[in-house]
């Protein structure tokens, strides 16, 4: 039994152009957290059970708000180590996946929203009880720096934590720095010491005095990148130039990329472009699968044809993203019609409708002419979310149901008397006036003052 420990040193923009903007903004403060998934390094075991060695989630980091105009810094990290306890033997070779997640702390209804910022993966050899190993991994424009180690929990000892060791009550016959171990009282165990000068970052050992190299590194002390040793025979001493007489195998010869990955040479080594679902220097790490529970916010994980192939998440309404980690601004689609106000309640959308409209999306015009008749021969005229009836002569009111009193407005001028009639109104004019509304005076000579033609 023992514990795998991961210490994140920094997460921020990697070197070179195209540095990412900060994942947080003044409008939307956020904080980071990390997830690590460990698998035994042998591919057949990894295929069987994702995160079979265990997984851990960090605490949330401090809240960070971007300073406008400032370059994206390394982001504040959670305190403490990520610890993954293991019950059985430490396998020596293992695969890891480290995910960097962002938790947005805006005023989202229904709580914070998560999004995956970066995912790095690799396969490493590591003996339990050894020193911290440092690593740098890049994911897109982001760079993650971290250290890791595996340590045994007492009374387990050894490079695989499979042997049990107990302190002796009797004076020890072992030399300085050595411990007596069960089951043989006279067996002493020395701490594992690799060959002197063995690179702590790129080398490891399983036996004292040895120096074995991680993928991509070579040389007696694992200090030489693979690509710089690709000359089969150097030019002779008479040659002023350096280089290769016979070109050695290129870093992509024989395609070192597994699982259908494609290889491209880089100035110092090679790079694999991996198919979906695979990660690592050589695409040797099968990625997160449904068994790892990658779908957030109630998302359903739909696996590929085989258990270890890439997954997809079907997201509940209101969430999106490859892991259902992003809350959808469903109101941005402007689902409320006729000027209705959209409210995203998290569990549902609501539209607050303007006066005169109704329905889940304010699609029903309560005042429209559909199904609304104007009585007594009136005709309906729509406009601006309201309707009005243009009534036939002799009728009035909203629906032309009221018999109009044509004389109510006193239409007869100059003291003329108004009489309602079935077809409208009749004015009886006072002496000296004439016209339908008694609007024209009659001149003494008998001519009326009609307007000129």
């Amino acid at each position: 039994a023992g514990v795998f420990e991961l210490q994140i040193h920094s997460f921020g923009p990697g070197p070179g152009p195209g540095a990412p903007r900060s994942p947080c903004s003044a409008r939307l403060p956020c904080r980071l957290f990390f997830r690590v998934c460990l698998k035994p390094g042998l591919s057949e075991e990894a295929a069987e059970s994702p995160c079979a060695l265990g997984a851990a989630l960090s605490a949330r980091g401090p809240v960070y708000t971007e300073q406008p105009g400032a370059p994206a810094p390394d982001l504040p990290l959670p305190d403490g180590l990520l610890q993954v306890p293991f019950r059985d033997a430490w396998p020596g070779t293992f695969s890891f996946i480290i995910e960097t997640w962002r938790e947005e702390l805006g005023d989202q209804i229904g709580g914070p929203a998560w999004s995956l910022l970066a995912r790095v993966a690799g396969r490493r050899r590591l003996a339990a009880g050894g020193p911290w190993a440092r690593d740098i991994q890049r994911a897109g424009a982001w760079e993650l720096r971290f250290s890791y180690r595996a340590r045994c929990e007492p009374p387990a000892v050894g490079t695989a934590c499979t042997r049990l060791c107990r302190p002796r009550s009797a004076p020890s016959r072992c030399g300085p720095g050595l411990r007596p171990c069960a089951p043989l009282e006279d067996e002493c165990e020395a701490p594992l010491v690799c060959r002197a000068g063995c690179s702590p970052e790129h080398g490891f050992c399983e036996q004292p005095g040895e120096c074995r190299c991680l993928e991509g590194w070579t040389g007696p002390l694992c200090t030489v990148p693979v690509s710089t040793s690709s000359c089969l025979s150097p030019r002779g001493p008479s040659s002023a130039t350096t280089g290769c007489l016979v070109p050695g195998p290129g870093p992509c010869d024989g395609n070192p990329c597994a699982n259908g990955g494609s290889c491209s040479e880089t100035p110092r080594s090679f790079e694999c472009t991996c198919p979906r679902g695979f990660y690592g220097l050589r695409c040797e790490v099968s990625g997160v699968t449904c068994a790892d529970g990658p779908c957030f916010n109630g998302g359903l994980c739909v696996g590929g044809a085989d258990p270890d192939s890439a997954y997809i998440c079907h997201c509940p309404p209101g969430f999106q993203g490859s892991n259902c980690e992003k809350r959808v601004d469903r109101c941005s689609l402007q689902p409320c019609r006729n000027g209705g106000l959209c409210l995203d309640l998290g569990h549902a959308l609501r539209c607050r409708c303007r006066a005169g409209f109704a329905g889940p999306r304010c699609e029903h015009d309560l005042d429209d002419c559909a199904g609304r008749a104007c009585a007594n021969g009136g005709t309906c005229v729509e406009g601006g979310g309201a309707h009005r009836c243009s009534c036939a002569l002799g009728f009035g009111g909203r629906d032309c149901r009221e018999r109009a009193d044509p004389c109510a407005a006193r239409p007869c001028a100059h003291g003329g008397r108004c009489y309602a009639h079935f077809s409208g109104l009749v004015c009886a004019c006072a002496p000296g006036y004439m016209g339908a509304r008694c609007e024209f005076p009659v001149h003494p000579d008998g001519a009326s003052a009609l307007p000129a033609a």
Epitope: D292, G299, L300, C301, G303, P316, H347
Partner: antibody, heavy 118, light 108 residues
Framework: QVQLQESGPGLVKPSETLSLTCTVS????????WSWIRQPPGKGLEWIGY???????NYNPSLKSRVTISLDTSKNQFSLKLSSVTAADTAVYYC????????????WGQGTLVTVSS | EIVLTQSPGTLSLSPGERATLSCRAS???????LAWYQQKPGQAPRLLIY???SRATGIPDRFSGSGSGTDFTLTISRLEPEDFAVYYC?????????FGGGTKVEIK
């Protein structure tokens, strides 16, 4: 209040295609996933598949080669077609709405018994 | 697929007693994406619990859910006459969606 109502023939001949329709009332079919579940007489529940209003579908692998679920938003309906039926497909078929916080079933139709027999 | 095994198959209890129903998964159910349903004869199932422990709308507080990983429990604190029915668990973390075989709670 959302209500679901299954409709379709109660008797289907072996090797034919079972066709059922679910009519949704009291709410729009948009913005939700809609599912079919069945229950053979005296047995447990079996999920058949679901459809999202955007057209996403997912079917139970045990039935996938025979199942089609489709949606008619204009009628607020979704449908199930199960081809090449046998007596083992005799069951009460339920339509249901999938919840907003995950893929559980929050509203169910009352179910319709479909018997496969010649 | 994730296989859900419910136990016991039948539970014989009297009204007022406490009922404890178990649902065990063949592999871990991610994020406690587990639901419980009640089904009475001739009726459709009714959602009781989702997310392993959240009560659905209108469900009395005598129903409670707990558990994570592979072991989940539905507890009915005091059985009412209307609670005698068949109870199903369902996982919704990984496709295909699967149900348990059911536990029948009958009157003793």
């Amino acid at each position: 209040q959302v209500q679901l109502q299954e409709s379709g023939p109660g008797l289907v001949k072996p090797s034919e295609t079972l066709s059922l329709t679910c009519t949704v009332s009291g709410g729009s079919i948009n913005s939700y996933y809609w599912s079919w579940i069945r229950q053979p007489p005296g047995k447990g529940l079996e999920w058949i598949g679901y459809i999202f209003y955007s057209g996403i579908t997912n079917y139970n692998p045990s039935l996938k080669s025979r199942v089609t679920i489709s949606l008619d938003t204009s009628k607020n309906q979704f449908s199930l077609k199960l081809s090449s039926v046998t007596a083992a497909d005799t069951a009460v078929y339920y339509c249901a709405r999938i919840g907003v916080a995950g893929f559980y079933f929050d509203y169910w139709g009352q179910g319709t018994l479909v018997t496969v027999s010649s | 697929e994730i296989v859900l095994t419910q136990s016991p198959g039948t539970l014989s209890l009297s009204p007022g007693e406490r009922a404890t129903l178990s649902c065990r998964a063949s592999q871990s159910v991610s994020s406690s994406y587990l639901a419980w349903y009640q089904q009475k004869p001739g009726q459709a199932p009714r959602l009781l619990i989702y997310g392993a422990s959240s009560r659905a709308t209108g469900i009395p507080d005598r129903f409670s859910g707990s558990g994570s990983g592979t072991d989940f429990t539905l507890t009915i604190s005091r059985l009412e006459p209307e609670d005698f029915a068949v109870y199903y668990c369902q996982q919704y973390g990984t496709s295909p969606l699967t149900f348990g075989g059911g536990t029948k709670v009958e009157i003793k």
